[in-house]
Interface confidence: low
């Protein structure tokens, strides 16, 4: 009989085991954006970005939603947030508008359920991109840990939108989640 | 019998919890990488840097290995990447080849089964070191969350390589495993 | 009988999941904390910053504590620490006292227990700030994975912070535990 | 691309499904909306949801419509009691938010009537 | 909700037309413009107040930000004639409808 209920157990533990840790990957939410370079809008005004990959190269996505340029959480949680923007101009693209630029990074989170948008991270800098020089280039980082509801969207605005580099490993943006909230 | 079912019971699921907790920490792989400044290249181009601590003051690892300038995955999962790299130049080092400098960094996975090496994430900036100013610096900060196989590597590459800030609170680069892949 | 023995182990097996999600939840220690911009110590020398919220806002704590402008570790583990540090001036605020301007961060440990105070991460860059553009604006973020004890502190000091930038969204570090120590 | 089908002729208070099937894209990764049109009239947002979160709906849709994932690449909106002021044609649409919908259906025709 | 005026406009071709949305509350730049023609679905034209569409002529133009907003088409075309819809993107929570009530623009 004790030997029986040790199998059974062994047996049960062992389905537990993998209950757990199948419901501990379905449990972590993530993403990583990358920039789509085919639609990124001209200007020098502060824009929101629209166009990411999702599901090539770099980019990848797991109990997360994206839309419209936005990235839609599906599951409450404290979340890791991050983004990565570079931006780049060559004197063969021609000239600059203007030689001083402000050239930022803005992550915001929209609340459909209460109509809300707040700025989570800002970063950036302003620059002289002197045209003694023929090749000029800048990136922004920023990160931090933020408690996310079901619902909301995460979205990324720039200035300076035609500026952007447009590689995978410069523009991109991304999320994971780091724990339940209590 | 039912007594002896539960204090069983009560033993046996204790040793699963310690089981399951010692798993879960082998299971969880990290490195944090500080420069080793007996060994930066000189130069100004872009070099893949090969010495790092990873066993003094802020360097540590675990279930990563480090070899040959390059961490080494060991196990399948996602991982979160970064790397701070900070530049600097004083004119008591003499004067720079060149007051327009472009100070980037690389990250950059390997993967040894099918030889490729792609850039998962770069950062810098072009800057202007004047001979105005008796000191010059900057840092960069890269970070971002992705899925890394056993066996593929980890390296940096950086520019201008001679004006690397050799602390360990100033260039170094890390990783630590979020999830396992599904 | 085994009926009996399934339907108690069921039950037991609950609770213990219950147990080990609660446990889960209490052994994740983080914190998000955003500047108190009615606290900013003013002039240009390097100074370590005392006032942060980590009640309002996007600022938040759980299982650290805030005490006297550090973040003090509750709970032995490994931790992705970050900090991202704004600084900006408007000619409308006066002038600067030099055009030329270091703009740092220095996210230091201090260990109580073995009285000492080091820095684990560094950023910054300097700058010219010229008279030329009516606005300024710079921002560093640095990042990186640290073995913490339970007592030692988190400080961030920076150089000139009077040009810090006040807002939740700019000026904040904080932390969040990723694993135990063996 | 984005293609709606299920629209006939039904009675009042037949239930009726329409389907929205998509390709070129994962719904697992994207919001869909529905939008209907009266004849001779302007758009009506009914409702959207998305992989993994509930729908949402317009007040006046809430109870009379609901919208639910039926596979990787369809979207279902049920007329769950249909009057005949839901004749319309019914379109299907990527997003909702600052961006948009973004790519449309050529939309399918409920006509109710007794 | 969104109102949206005027319900019809004339104009000559070379023309400029301009139709306005105002929000019920403020929906910060959550706002898209949409062109509909007889018998086709609606186009995307505008998204986030003022970004346009790929492949949309840049005589469309969307302005403003809160509650009002602007859709503003210079040197009108004869293809340009149809329905335009504004459209909040928002709020999901306790709205009626996220479209404006539409502008006919007949193009003389």
């Known amino acids: 009989g004790s030997q029986h209920i040790r199998a059974e157990k062994a047996m049960v533990d062992g389905s537990w085991l993998d209950l757990a840790k199948r419901s501990k990957l379905e449990a972590q939410p993530f993403a990583h954006l990358t920039i789509n370079a085919t639609d990124i809008p001209s200007g020098s005004h502060k824009v929101s970005l629209s166009s990411w990959y999702h599901d090539r190269g770099w980019a990848k996505i797991s109990n997360m939603t994206f839309s419209n340029g936005k990235l839609i959480v599906n599951q409450d949680g404290f979340y890791y947030l991050y983004a990565n923007i570079c931006f780049r101009h060559h004197e063969t693209s021609g000239d600059l508008a203007t030689e001083y630029l402000q050239l930022m990074v803005y992550v915001t989170k929209t609340s459909i359920k209460i109509p809300s948008s707040h700025t989570l991270m800002k970063g950036g800098s302003t620059k002289y991109w002197s045209g003694n020089s023929e090749f000029h280039f800048y990136s922004i980082n920023v990160g931090g840990f933020f408690k996310l509801r079901s619902g909301e969207e995460i979205s990324i605005e720039v200035s300076n939108p035609s500026l952007l580099d447009p590689d995978q490993d410069a523009t991109y943006f991304g999320a994971f989640k780091v724990r339940d909230i209590d | 019998g039912s007594q002896h079912i539960r204090a069983e019971k009560a033993m046996v699921d204790g040793s699963w919890l310690d089981l399951a907790k010692r798993s879960k920490l082998e299971a969880q792989p990290f490195a944090h990488l500080t420069i080793n400044a007996t060994d930066i290249p000189s130069g100004s181009h872009k070099v893949s840097l090969s010495s790092w601590y990873h066993d003094r003051g802020w360097a540590k690892i675990s279930n990563m290995t480090f070899s040959n300038g390059k961490l080494i995955v060991n196990q399948d999962g996602f991982y979160y990447l970064y790397a701070n790299i900070c530049f600097r130049h004083h004119e008591t080092s003499g004067d720079l080849a060149t007051e327009y400098l472009q100070l980037m960094v690389y990250v950059t996975k390997t993967s040894i089964k099918i030889p490729s090496s792609h850039t998962l994430m770069k950062g810098g900036s072009t800057k202007y070191w004047s001979g105005n100013s008796e000191f010059h610096f900057y840092s960069i900060n890269v970070g971002g969350f992705f899925k890394l196989r056993s066996g593929e590597e980890i390296s940096i590459e950086v520019s201008n390589p001679s004006l690397l800030d050799p602390d360990q609170d100033a260039t170094y680069f890390g990783a630590f495993k979020v999830r396992d892949i599904d | 009988g085994s009926q009996h023995i399934r339907a108690e182990k069921a039950m037991v097996d609950g609770s213990w999941l219950d147990l080990a999600k609660r446990s889960k939840l209490e052994a994740q220690p983080f914190a998000h904390l955003t500047i108190n911009a009615t606290d900013i110590p003013s002039g240009s020398h390097k100074v370590s910053l005392s006032s942060w919220y980590h009640d309002r806002g996007w600022a938040k704590i759980s299982n650290m504590t805030f005490s006297n402008g550090k973040l003090i570790v509750n709970q032995d583990g490994f931790y992705y620490l970050y900090a991202n540090i704004c600084f900006r001036h408007h000619e409308t605020s006066g002038d600067l006292a030099t055009e030329y301007l270091q703009l740092m961060v220095y996210v230091t440990k201090t260990s109580i227990k073995i009285p000492s105070s080091h820095t684990l991460m560094k950023g910054g860059s300097t700058k010219y700030w010229s008279g030329n553009s009516e606005f300024h604006f710079y921002s560093i973020n640095v990042g990186g994975f640290f073995k913490l004890r339970s007592g030692e502190e988190i400080s961030i000091e920076v150089s000139n912070p009077s040009l810090l930038d006040p807002d939740q969204d700019a000026t904040y570090f904080g932390a969040f535990k990723v694993r135990d120590i063996d | 691309s984005v293609e709606e089908s299920g629209g006939r002729l039904v009675t009042p208070g037949t239930p009726l499904t329409l389907t929205c099937t998509v390709s070129g894209f994962s719904l697992s990764n994207d919001v869909m909306s529905w939008v209907r049109q009266a004849p001779g009239k302007g758009l009506e947002w009914i409702g959207y949801?998305?992989?993994?979160?509930?729908p949402y709906y317009a007040n006046w849709a809430k109870g009379r419509f609901t919208i639910s994932k039926s596979s990787s690449t369809t979207v279902d909106l049920k007329i769950t009691s249909p009057t005949t002021e839901d004749t319309a044609a019914y379109f299907c649409a990527r997003g909702f938010g600052s961006s948009g919908l973004n790519i449309w259906g050529p939309g399918t025709l409920v006509t109710v009537s007794l | 909700d969104m109102t949206q005026t005027p319900a019809s406009v004339e104009v000559a071709v070379g023309g400029t037309v301009t139709i306005k949305c105002q929000a019920s509350?403020?929906?910060?730049?959550?706002l898209a413009w949409y062109q509909q023609k007889p018998g086709q679905s609606p186009k995307l034209l505008i998204y986030s107040a003022s970004i346009l569409a790929s492949g949309v002529p840049s005589r469309f133009k969307g302005s403003g930000s809160g509650t009002q907003f602007t859709l503003t088409i210079s040197g009108v075309q004869c293809d340009d004639a149809a329905t335009y819809y504004c459209?909040?993107?928002?709020?999901?929570?306790?709205?009626?409808?996220?479209f404006g009530g539409g502008t006919e623009v007949v193009v003389k």
């Open positions: 509350q403020s929906i910060g730049s959550n």
């Open positions: 459209q909040q993107g928002y709020s999901v929570g306790n709205i009626d409808n996220a």
């Open positions: 949801i998305w992989s993994g979160g509930s």
